[in-house]
């Protein structure tokens, strides 16, 4: 017959934490290592699993179908509950029985979700909920690959993604002194970069170039690229596109200039000149499918050109440059030099040689154009 | 393993049409870029034509164009091109040939043979 | 449309020769270039896509290089096999185009 089972033999509850959908395993030891009976049971003292003889019995629980036991490890004296596929309704104390003795085990179970999908464009806020069983007080400390730290309770946002919040999030849930660890992966849907300038001499081949922050196995969408000249009153559609996987493929394109585009990923421009009325900014978007709002990419020209017309030899530059950039005309192993923080300087009657104009930016030189003056003589005089 | 196999070519009068079709087997059809490419006697390769699996969206060299057209039928398996007008110099041995996943022809049939001559 | 010229249009080397050959794209290209050896009476075979990178199967003396508009087939070591035509072809965007073939010969 069994005997009762006294209050000193209740060992001090454990507390569990586990994650949904995981495999949690409960432990329970006896003191002598040998196989010996135990039970499984939860608070309303429901059986869940057992030793019968030498074999495995399940009660009439919920977990049944989940709840299973180490028998490798029973000859050792562990009687360990395996609960699979965690459900936050899985909350409970447990209770396992041997010996006669109470060994109780507190199970609290968590989830973690992202409210909307996991592929989200820059700037689109990120919202985490936590899941959690009735009475518990949780907190949560998340931190994005990028080392930003957020903490909360039962929601967790972050209004802005930015491109460095691609990747995994780890996020730590805290109850009760344990702690709960969740990992997941958030994808920013964004061009690796927001914003880039070419600087090109007149007549060069120009490139631009727009990859991706980021990989997804299926790809849908359409582009375009819109261009404001310096020198137009309004912007121009230059090229519009469609994107499915990585196969681009041109829909429309403007005649002057003649562009050309990469015809899978990543997105990539060809113009085949620089010229002063091409010279602009331009912004490229691209719209996802079931995706709201589109990604952008800023892109600048700056073109380049020098010239010599009778006495006078002209360095300009068109397109967006920054106040701060120097644009001068020097003579190649001379001292003579032109600078200006403007975007034209010019030298009178140059001395013959090889003359370099050079746009910098704090000593680092953006561009540069060679111009070769040739001397004049001066016509003689007639009598 | 991946198979295309060519057929259809033949001896044809000037001006006169012929279809030519690319039987594949061995990869999921739809998936890929197809392509036709030509080759002259005693002369390099010369693309003609391709069509999207994803997109159907064609192409076509200058060459031909308005006078060729390709097409698929992703149920049977099968590319095809459609010759029309057709001239001297378009003699040759068409080759049928699939795309990879980086859009490169990487697989090519053994090519079936053209002959426009009256 | 692009042109790519190859070259040189054909050479004569011998076994265990160092064999390299050119294509200039008339514009930039990338690294959307892929090269192909055709023997006699045969389909063209697939070397190296993206410039530089190699078919799986194809020998490890064959190598790409090259990004923009300069590109470069090298056969490090001549094999009898090896004697056939090489064609480079832009990938960067339709009209395909191919060079117009390099064929290696016995010397």
């Known amino acids: 017959e069994q005997k009762l089972i006294s209050e000193e033999d209740l060992a001090a509850k454990k507390v569990v934490l586990g994650k949904k959908g995981d495999t949690v395993e409960l432990t329970c030891n006896a003191s002598q290592k040998k196989n010996t009976q135990f039970h499984w049971k939860n608070s309303n003292q429901i059986k869940i699993l057992g030793i019968q003889g030498l074999f495995l019995t399940k009660g009439p629980s919920k977990l049944s179908d989940r709840a299973d036991s180490r028998k490798s490890l029973w000859d050792q004296g562990c009687f360990s509950m395996i609960i699979k596929n965690l459900k936050i309704e899985d909350s409970d104390t447990y209770i396992c029985e041997v010996e006669n003795k109470k060994e109780e085990v507190e199970l609290l179970v968590f989830g973690l979700t992202a409210n909307s999908d996991t592929h989200l464009l820059e700037g689109q806020s990120l919202t985490l909920t936590l899941e959690s069983p009735p009475g518990s007080s949780p907190s949560v400390k998340c931190r994005s690959p990028g080392g930003k730290n957020i903490q909360g309770g039962r929601t967790i946002s972050v209004p802005q993604l930015e491109r460095q919040d691609s990747g995994t999030w780890t996020c730590t849930v805290s109850q009760d002194q344990k702690t709960v660890e969740f990992k997941i992966d958030i994808v920013v849907l964004a061009f690796q970069k927001a914003s880039s300038t070419v600087y090109k001499k007149e007549g060069e081949q120009v490139e631009f170039s727009f990859p991706l922050a980021f990989t997804l196995e299926k790809l849908t969408g359409s582009g375009e690229l819109w261009w404001q000249a310096e020198r137009a009153s309004s912007s121009k559609s230059w090229i519009t596109f469609d994107l499915k996987n990585k196969e681009v493929s041109v829909k429309r394109v403007t005649q002057d200039p003649k562009l050309q585009m990469g015809k899978k990923l990543p997105l990539h421009l060809t113009l085949p000149q620089a010229l002063p009325q091409y010279a602009g900014s331009g912004n490229l978007t691209l719209a996802l499918e079931a995706k709201t709002g589109k990604l952008h990419q800023e892109v600048n020209l700056v073109v380049m050109r020098a010239t010599q017309f009778q006495e006078n030899l002209t360095c300009e530059v068109w397109g967006p440059t920054s106040p701060k950039l120097t644009l001068s005309l020097k003579l190649e192993n001379k001292g003579a030099t032109v600078s200006k923080q403007a975007k034209a300087v010019w030298v009178l009657n140059p001395e013959a040689g090889m003359w370099q104009c050079l746009l910098s930016d704090s000593g680092q030189v953006l561009l540069e154009s060679n111009i070769k003056v040739v001397p004049t003589w001066p016509t003689p005089v007639q009598p | 393993e991946v198979q295309l196999l060519e057929s259809g070519g033949g001896l044809v009068q000037p001006g006169g049409s012929l279809r030519l079709s690319c039987s594949a087997s061995g990869f999921t059809f739809s998936d890929y870029v197809m392509s036709w490419v030509r080759q002259a006697p005693g002369k390099g390769l010369d693309w003609v034509s391709s069509i999207s699996g994803l997109t159907g969206n064609t192409y076509h060299a200058d060459s031909v164009k308005g006078r060729f057209t390709i097409s698929r039928d992703n149920s049977k398996n099968t590319l095809y091109l459609q010759m029309s007008s057709l001239r001297d110099e378009d003699t040759a041995v068409y080759y049928c040939?699939?795309?990879?996943?980086?859009?490169?022809?990487?697989?090519w049939g053994k090519g079936t043979t053209v002959t426009v001559s009256s | 449309a692009i042109q790519m010229t190859q070259s040189p249009s054909s050479l004569s080397a011998s076994v265990g020769d160092r064999v390299t050959i050119t294509c200039r794209a008339s514009?930039?290209?990338?690294?959307?270039l892929g090269w192909y050896q055709q023997k006699p009476g045969k389909a063209p075979k697939f070397l190296i896509s993206?410039?530089?990178s190699l078919q799986s199967g194809v020998p490890s003396r064959f190598s790409g290089s090259g990004y923009g508009t300069d590109f470069t087939l090298t056969i490090s070591s001549l094999q009898p096999e090896d004697f056939a035509t090489y064609y480079c072809?832009?990938?960067?965007?339709?009209?395909?185009?191919f060079g117009q073939g390099t064929k290696v010969e016995i010397k």
């Open positions: 993206a410039a530089s």
């Open positions: 514009q930039g290209i990338r690294n959307d």
């Open positions: 040939a699939k795309d990879n996943e980086d859009y490169y022809m990487d697989v």
């Open positions: 072809l832009q990938d960067y965007t339709y009209p395909r185009t």
